[in-house]
Structure formats: C-alpha cells, structure tokens
Amino acid sequence: EINGSANYEMFIFHNGGVQILCKYPDIVQQFKMQLLKGGQILCDLTKTKGSGNTVSIKSLKFCHSQLSNNSVSFFLYNLDHSHANYYFCNLSIFDPPPFKVTLTGGYLHIYESQLCCQLK
C-alpha cells in the first residue's frame, strides 16, 4: 500500500550524490526503514531498544545512512542516469504498536548538473 508522495523535499543533491530523506514521527521508538528503488530493497536500517533502553542500530542491506530523531537519510554516490527511478521509504513501526507499515516516495530526476563527473 502506497500512502502517498512525500510531502517534504525527499532528495537533496550534493557533490555528485544524493541524500534521500525518509521521515517518521519522532515518538516512534522502534522501527525498520527500507529504501526501495522501484520494488528492489537498496538499503535498510533497523532501530530497536533493549533492556535499559539501550538502542541498537542494524542494517542487513548497508548503505551510508544517518539517523536522527525523526528521519533516516540514505546516501547514494556517483550518480548517473541509471539512478533515475521511483524511490520509496518503507517504514515498519514496531513501537508503539500496533504494527504499522507506511510507504512514501517520489521520482528521482537526474539532470546533467547533478552528475558526479561531468565533462567540462
């Protein structure tokens, strides 16, 4: 189920790469965030809490990522035209339950000015 397009700037370009921003409400305590390209899982990050509220961060499909209290950023480098596609943030909420999944996304347009190694 696609809940809709991201209602925020999902793609931030810099230095021939792109930061893909996946937001979630900051009261979510435990979750898994997956970055999908089309239907393929590119990256994931899982945040869980153990006894004593110790936080554990795990990735099965590792990308360079950054976690804040209300977003996960995934970074893609060396952009080329093949990166142009629909990208989705697939959020699975474990805590607080009930378990919930939500999918938001947008289309990543690649323009010449954003490519990593343009010919001058």
Partner: antibody, heavy 117, light 107 residues
Framework: QITLKESGPTLVKPTQTLTLTCTFS??????????VGWIRQPPGKALEWLAL???????RYSPSLKSRLTITKDSSKNQVVLTMTNMDPVDTATYYC?????????WGQGILVTVSS | DIQMTQSPSSLSASVGDRVTITCRAS??????LAWYQQKPEKAPKSLIY???SLQSGVPSRFSGSGSGTDFTLTISSLQPEDFATYYC?????????FGGGTKVEIK
C-alpha cells in the same frame, strides 16, 4: 504542552449524523505526532475505542461501528473530525479525542453528546 | 478482538493501604498495556504504558507489572487523590480495547 479539545453539538436527534471536531496543539501530525483517536464513554460505563487516524492518513475503526464512522484530518488546521451516522439514544456518551502514543497519553476534556428526540 | 477483564470491579480501601488491581487479556499482548486513572466528570489520565513504564509526572507510588496475558497495577500507599476509577487498555492490535474499570472507593 500538548492539548486537545472536542467541539460539536451536545444534542442530536435519532437518525441524525454527529460531527465532532478535535482541535489540538503542542504537536504536529507527522513530525512529532503519530495519530489522534476517538474514544467514548456512556454515562456510568466503561471506555470504548471508536477510531484512529495516523499522520499518513491511515485510518482504523472499531469493527462494530465501522459502517457508521468516518475519521478525517486537516493537518494545516491541527484538526481531526469524526462523523457518526444514524445516531441512536444508545450512542449517548462523552466523546473524547486523544493523542496516540503508547496507548493514549493526552486526552481532551470530552464532550457529552445526548441523543434524544 | 482481544477482551480485557479487570478485577475487582470495585474495592474499598483506606488511605495508606496497598492496592492491587489486575487486568487479564484474552490472548497474549506482550507488554503493550496502558493504565488510566479517571475521576468523576474528568477525562482519563495516562498513568502507565508498556505495562510498567510510568508516564512523566505520575507519582512513584503507582507501578505496573506483567506481560503476556496477566497484568497488575499497584498503588503502594493510597492517597486521598487516588480514589478514582482505573482502566487498562491493550494496544497490541486493533481493535484497541479497554477493561471494564475498577472503582477504588474510600472505606
């Protein structure tokens, strides 16, 4: 500081549609608010969950009342609206809206709705 | 649906007493249980979430325990302001369900 307040009619006639509005402050659905729910309590009875709407517009309803309930949100106005069709005297209750976290951590003061002809 | 059964439905106690209220779920809900306090003509107030975590600002005389199907709310030393009705609620799955309430009265 999170606050919620219910508004709407306090008296409705049988078969009419009830529309209640929850206006909230201190959180924003999507950034630091997961969702808003509605709960009711008939006089002298227990609490009953009715409906909930998430920041992403995902909606959940009590199965026994699903056919009569609609929940919507207007994030720009910080409001959540519950409509309940075909009201009956047994629907007389105090209706509460509440902020969804682990359970419901903040509640409105409630609005007593009486169904009578 | 998960049924939540509270016992007793009412109890009489004195200031300073230790009070225990139980809540039983019809199927396992892990630790996804909340407790609320409600005074006459007032909205419920959240006391405990995740079975044993105290909400901010709630006095430490309130405590919760349990997991799976059996849960307990304990007031270690009853105070005059604690006379109220207490409800449990499961939020493991939809539909969200509440217990029938336990009224704590003055003996």
């Amino acid at each position: 500081q999170i606050t919620l307040k219910e508004s709407g009619p306090t008296l409705v006639k049988p078969t009419q549609t009830l529309t209640l509005t929850c206006t909230f402050s201190g959180f924003s659905l999507g950034s630091n608010g997961l969702g808003v729910g509605w709960i009711r309590q008939p006089p002298g009875k227990a609490l009953e969950w009715l409906a909930l709407i998430y920041w992403d517009d995902d909606k959940r309803y009590s199965p026994s009342l699903k056919s009569r309930l609609t929940i919507t949100k207007d994030s720009s106005k910080n409001q959540v609206v519950l409509t309940m069709t075909n009201m009956d005297p047994v629907d007389t209750a105090t209706y509460y809206c509440a902020h969804r976290n682990s359970g419901f951590d903040y509640w409105g003061q409630g609005i007593l709705v009486t169904v009578s002809s | 649906d998960i049924q939540m059964t509270q016992s007793p439905s009412s109890l009489s106690a004195s200031v300073g007493d230790r009070v225990t209220i139980t809540c039983r779920a019809s199927q396992g809900i892990s630790s996804w249980l909340a407790w609320y306090q409600q005074k006459p003509e007032k909205a419920p107030k959240s006391l405990i979430y995740a079975a044993s975590s105290l909400q901010s600002g709630v006095p430490s005389r309130f405590s919760g325990s349990g997991s799976g199907t059996d849960f307990t709310l304990t007031i270690s030393s009853l105070q005059p302001e604690d006379f109220a009705t207490y409800y449990c609620q499961q939020y493991n799955s939809y539909p969200l369900t509440f217990g029938g309430g336990t009224k704590v009265e003055i003996k």
